[in-house]
């Protein structure tokens, strides 16, 4: 979704996203030729940055408003290129598809790991979450598992009553040829969720980042 | 600082119900997995609940599945345990404690109330 | 369910000295579930150590925890007049998150 145009303007920066580009100058002037552990320097920006005073962050968070501005401004100006609106057509009274086991302990841990390294980007969030999840004893995990098998079962009952039911036509034009093998079709909407459970998350993840912004 | 206190303990007759509360400070109570711990006098420890930090998922010990009720107030940094057709063997101690990540490891205990179960 | 055997029940021991304490599975566990507290006559358990050998922020580094498998094992070195305490490990690996039965510390 405009990932790869170059003309996108480069999306807004936050306060401690200017504070850690800072910290990682520094410390490439300090030690231009030492490798960054990053889990051991995003620990400790995100320490400083928590024993920062308001005044000295004050810097930093008008350089995240004039970043803002400047977005802001870029982003009146920026067209989309023509094929970035919706592949297909989503019916928006389909089934959502179920979320898996770890998508449901992510929606329980996600907000610590983001409260505890304010500065991790989406990726190095999942990772953390990633690593928290492999640590799980299987115990643990059962009643996501659980959940996650319980919704599962009832998305299966539900997406057969709307396969059912025949979808609006809109959607039949949009998706699906009429000479597809069934197979295909069925493949073809898996796929077509999971983007959905993806968008979701991404989604989740952009809203959680505003309501850092505004923190 | 970061405290657990419970309360809600006291002398209860074979049968009878008690709800425990303990109310959390100096963090984020939200984030964590919270856990009620017992101890019998002179007894070791055992592990009797769990919650997660949205509270959407629970689990018990065999010996007080379907008897005893864990759940938890967010806003207001409170997790209880509703014990219910108590017995004099769960006469003890009761902590509630916060689990290390999402590993039983527990890293802030509560003082712990005390629960008798007799007639 | 997982059984977790502690011995010696009592250890005498004199501020200053070192002490071994063991801890056994009925079988084989993962050490990165498994945990060590101690616990002081009226007061409630203090996290040690968890993972087998990590130490929580606050705890001295005259506590350290080793051992897989079955075996595990918490030294004390250099005892000092607060460590004279019940010590208690604990696997949390699988329900119901089973605690050893104790080894009491006392002072000689």
């Known amino acids: 979704m405009g990932k790869g145009d170059p003309k996108k303007p480069r999306g807004k920066m936050s306060s401690y996203a200017f504070f850690v580009q800072t910290c990682r100058e520094e410390h490439k002037k300090k030690h231009p030729d030492a490798s960054v552990n990053f889990s051991e320097f995003s620990k400790k920006c995100s320490e400083r940055w928590k024993t920062m005073s308001a005044k000295e962050k004050g810097k930093f968070e008008d350089m995240a408003k004039a970043d803002k501005a400047r977005y802001e401004r870029e982003m009146k100006t920026y067209i989309p290129p023509k094929g970035e609106t919706k592949k297909k057509f989503k019916d928006p009274n389909a089934p959502k598809r179920p979320p898996s086991a770890f998508f449901l302990f992510c929606s329980e841990y996600r907000p610590k790991i983001k409260g505890e390294h304010p500065g991790l980007s989406i990726g190095d969030v999942a990772k953390k979450l990633g690593e928290m999840w492999n640590n799980t004893a299987a115990d643990d995990k059962q009643p996501y598992e659980k959940k996650a098998a319980k919704l599962k079962e009832k998305y299966e009952k539900d997406i057969a009553a709307y396969r059912a039911k025949g979808k609006p036509d809109a959607a039949k034009k949009g998706v699906v040829k009429a000479e597809k093998s069934k197979k295909k079709k069925e493949e073809e909407e898996d796929e077509e969720d999971e983007e959905d459970e993806e968008e979701e998350e991404d989604e989740e993840d952009e809203d959680e980042e505003e309501d850092d912004d505004d923190e | 600082e970061v405290q657990l206190l419970e309360s809600g303990g006291g002398l209860v007759q074979p049968g009878g119900s008690l709800r425990l509360s303990c109310a959390a400070s100096?963090?984020?109570?939200?984030?964590?997995?919270m856990t009620w711990v017992r101890q019998a006098p002179g007894k070791g420890l055992e592990w009797v609940s769990s919650?997660?930090?949205?509270?959407?998922?629970?689990s018990y010990a065999d010996s007080v599945k379907g008897r005893f009720t864990i759940s938890r107030d967010n806003s207001k940094n409170t997790l209880y345990l509703q014990m219910n057709s108590l017995r004099a063997e769960d006469t003890a101690v009761y902590y509630c404690?916060?689990?290390?990540?999402?590993?039983?490891?527990?890293?802030?205990w509560g003082q712990g109330t005390m629960v008798t179960v007799s007639s | 369910d997982i059984q977790m055997t502690q011995s010696p029940g009592t250890l005498s021991l004199s501020p200053g000295e070192s002490g071994t304490l063991s801890c056994r599975a009925s079988?084989?566990?993962?050490?990165?579930?498994f945990a060590w507290y101690q616990q002081k006559p009226g007061q409630a358990p203090r996290l040690l150590i968890y993972g087998a050998s990590s130490r929580p922020t606050g705890i001295p580094d005259r506590f350290s925890g080793s051992g897989s498998g079955t075996d595990f094992t918490l030294t004390l070195s250099r005892l000092e007049p607060e460590d004279f305490a019940v010590y208690f490990c604990?696997?949390?690996?699988?329900?119901?998150?089973?605690f050893g039965g104790g080894t009491k510390v006392e002072m000689k």
């Open positions: 100096g963090f984020t109570f939200s984030w964590y997995k």
């Open positions: 404690a916060r689990d290390l990540d999402i590993r039983h490891a527990f890293d802030i």
């Open positions: 604990q696997y949390y690996g699988s329900s119901p998150y089973t």
């Open positions: 919650i997660s930090p949205s509270g959407g998922f629970t």
């Open positions: 079988e084989s566990v993962s050490s990165r579930h």
